[in-house]
Each structure stands twice: as C-alpha cells, then as structure tokens.
C-alpha cells in the first residue's frame, strides 16, 4: 500500500496545528515534566513488516484522536484549532485503514503485532493517568501536548521509512 502524498502533508499540518494550540508560557510548566515512557522501539521500523508498522501507526493516531476528543480536551484548547487538528487525524486514520485492508492479503504474518499495539495503549493510559492526577491543569495539558508532538514526530519518521521501502 502506498500512503498518498496528502497523508504526509496531513502529518505536517497536524504537527503545526498542535504547535499552535499552546496557550500558556511553557516555561512555567517545567516542574510538571513527566516520563511517559514513550515506546520508542515500536517506531524504529526495523523489526516490523509493513502491515505491522501500519497497525502501530494506526493505533498511535487513533489513541491521539481519542485523547483530544474528550470533554476535558475541549475545555483545554481553542476550539477551531482543536477541530482542525482532529480532522487531520481523522483523515490519517482513513488513509491508514485503507492500507491495513490492502496489506492483509499481501503478508502472511499476523496483521496485529499485539505486543506493540499494547505498548502504545499503555503509553496513552499513562498519559491519561497523569492528566487525571494533575486534575487536567493547564500545565499538565502543555506537557502532554509537547509529548504528543514528540510521539507524532516519531510516527512521521516511521512513515517516511515505510515510503522509502516501497
């Protein structure tokens, strides 16, 4: 499956929108930094076959979409930016889902790399727990926004590597 060029443009747009969503000075939030244990090894793209990599990417985007679709998120961010961001993620999910369907017939290995998918889910559980413990404070959301920007950058890099393999 060849992800369309619009997909990588969507990635960049999503990152730009996320960067624009900041509302308070980041400098005041330093003490709220937290180790969410991003599963970096799931995004290095070496041990994966393409179908598995696409599944992990899909889970990453799906969980990001879910996180920013909550009521607490709506209260934290400027509505029009949040809507645009969610729209970009939704489009990426559609692209990836189309790829997942194509790749099922191409590879004999199981589509879902369960351990990798689980690692991504647990990562987002840690993020949600952190937000809960911090009572969804503005600084907690800033820390999470910075973390998601970092993890989406890893996703973007994995997609670039997948395109180079084609």
């Amino acid at each position: 499956c060849d992800l369309p060029q619009t997909h990588s443009l969507g990635n960049r747009r999503a990152l730009i929108l996320l960067a624009q969503m900041g509302r308070i000075s980041h400098f005041s939030c330093l003490k709220d930094r937290h180790d969410f244990g991003f599963p970096e090894e799931e995004f290095d793209g070496h041990q994966f076959q393409k179908a598995q990599a696409i599944s992990v990417l899909h889970e990453m985007i799906q969980q990001t979409f879910n996180l920013f679709s909550t009521e607490d998120s709506s209260a934290a961010w400027e509505q029009s930016l949040l809507e645009k961001f969610s729209t970009e993620l939704y489009q990426q999910l559609n692209d990836l889902e189309a790829c997942v369907i194509q790749e099922v017939g191409v590879e004999e290995t199981p589509l879902m790399n369960e351990d990798s998918i689980l690692a991504v889910r647990k990562y987002f559980q840690r993020i949600t727990l952190y937000l809960t413990e911090k009572k969804y404070s503005p600084c907690a959301w800033e820390v999470v926004r910075a973390e998601i920007m970092r993890s989406l950058s890893f996703s973007t890099n994995l997609q670039k590597r997948l395109r180079r393999k084609d």
């Epitope: 980041h26 939030c29 930094r33 970092r150």
Partner: antibody, heavy 121, light 107 residues
Framework: EVQLVQSGAEVKKPGESLKISCKGS????????IGWVRQMPGKGLEWMGI????????AYSPSFQGQVTISADKSISTAYLQWSSLKASDTAMYYC??????????????WGQGTLVTVSS | DIQMTQSPSSLSASVGDRVTITCRAS??????LNWYQQKPGKAPKLLIY???SLQSGVPSRFSGSGSGTDFTLTISSLQPEDFATYYC?????????FGQGTKVEIK
C-alpha cells in the same frame, strides 16, 4: 549529527553593540529551546536566559534581564544573543545549548563551541 | 531564585580513587538536577540528567543520586581524563542555576 555552531570571537569597545549567533543543525530546531550561558575568565557557569524558537517566548535570569536580548530566527535555525551597549564586565565566553523543553529528555545535551567576547578600550 | 551549593569547591585525588561531589538546592527541585564536566577551553559536557540518568556515551563509572534538595555525583574509579571541573545545575524552575563548580585535581 546534531550540532550547535556559534559565531566567531569578537573584540569590541565599551558602548558598542554586538549580536552573536548560534546555528542549530541535525535536529528539528523548533522542538528544542536554546539557552545561553556566560563564563567569565577563570569563573564558573552562569545561566543567562532561554528562548523557545517555536514562538520566540523568552525568559531571563534576573541578573541579565535588561542587559541582553535573546532572539531567534526559526527560518534559518539560528538563535541570537545581543547587547546594545557593551561594558568591560561583559568580557566572557558565551555558550549556547539546546534544551528539550517540556519533554522528558536530557537537558542541555548539546552545546555550542562558545563565542569569546572581549570588551576593551 | 534557587541557590545551588556544591562541595567541596576543589579536591585532590589519585587515579583509581572513588570521588564524591555533593550539591544542595535551597529548595526542593524534585529530580531536576544535571551534572556537567568541563575541561579548560572546552564547552561543558552533560554527564547526568534527572539526577541519576546517565547521558548516552558517558562511562558507567559516573553515577548520580538524590532527590529533593540533596544530590551526589560519584566517580567510582577516577581516570586520568576525569580531571576537570564539575558543575551541578537545577532545571526545576526558571531561572536555571548552576553550582559554583568543583575542581578535581591530580594529587
């Protein structure tokens, strides 16, 4: 390869202005903050201030507030430290270093090579 | 501002010695404490971040510990290339501040 490359040594007279630079490469420049550190001859490290190149938000140490200006041009991945009127006491080595912002990653993991500023009449 | 106090300000040691440098913050900084090594004419080099995490490429003889206000840098077996000045720095809140430095000299 991540690199921070600073502009060359400067010799200035008291009262003159100066702008030194720090160019980042090998990483996403807007994903890291850039901090500036002063080291006067034979002395320790002093933290001056920091900039977030993504939005040019700055913060200064009280000792340097109003004495220097930190800026950045993200289009050319460069941060700046400037003086409008130098004093002899500004003679020092100035370092830039990158900081991961709110991400859980090593602080100030890469440093520039330093810019030696000499102010003398 | 948070004050960082290092001790000792200098020490003499021999190759193979175990060396300990302490750093005390004037208020709690959780684990947001970094250690740097600086050699004459060179930029500082990050050794330890978040109080105890070893920076990539740094030899395992360097270790850090502590939380809150009291922190320690330990060099388990001093090597010739370790003779330098060491600085602690807090990154809990702005302005970031450095300790005054500890110079490790050859005995």
């Amino acid at each position: 390869e991540v690199q921070l490359v600073q502009s060359g040594a400067e010799v200035k007279k008291p009262g003159e202005s100066l702008k030194i630079s720090c160019k980042g490469s090998g990483y996403s420049f807007t994903s890291y903050w850039i901090g500036w550190v002063r080291q006067m001859p034979g002395k320790g490290l002093e933290w001056m201030g920091i900039i977030d190149p993504s939005d040019s938000d700055t913060a200064y140490s009280p000792s340097f507030q109003g004495q220097v200006t930190i800026s950045a041009d993200k289009s050319i991945s460069t941060a700046y430290l400037q003086w409008s009127s130098l004093k002899a006491s500004d003679t020092a080595m100035y370092y830039c270093a990158r900081h991961p912002g709110l991400n859980w990653a090593p602080d100030f993991d890469y440093w520039g090579q330093g810019t030696l500023v000499t102010v003398s009449s | 501002d948070i004050q960082m106090t290092q001790s000792p300000s200098s020490l003499s040691a021999s190759v193979g010695d175990r060396v300990t440098i302490t750093c005390r913050a004037s208020q709690s900084i959780s684990k947001f404490l970094n250690w740097y090594q600086q050699k004459p004419g060179k930029a500082p080099k990050l050794l330890i971040y978040f109080a105890s995490s070893l920076q990539s490429g740094v030899p395992s003889r360097f270790s850090g510990s502590g939380s809150g206000t009291d922190f320690t840098l330990t060099i388990s077996s001093l090597q010739p290339e370790d003779f330098a000045t060491y600085y602690c720095q807090q990154s809990n809140t702005l302005p970031f501040t450095f300790g005054q430095g500890t110079k490790v000299e050859i005995k």
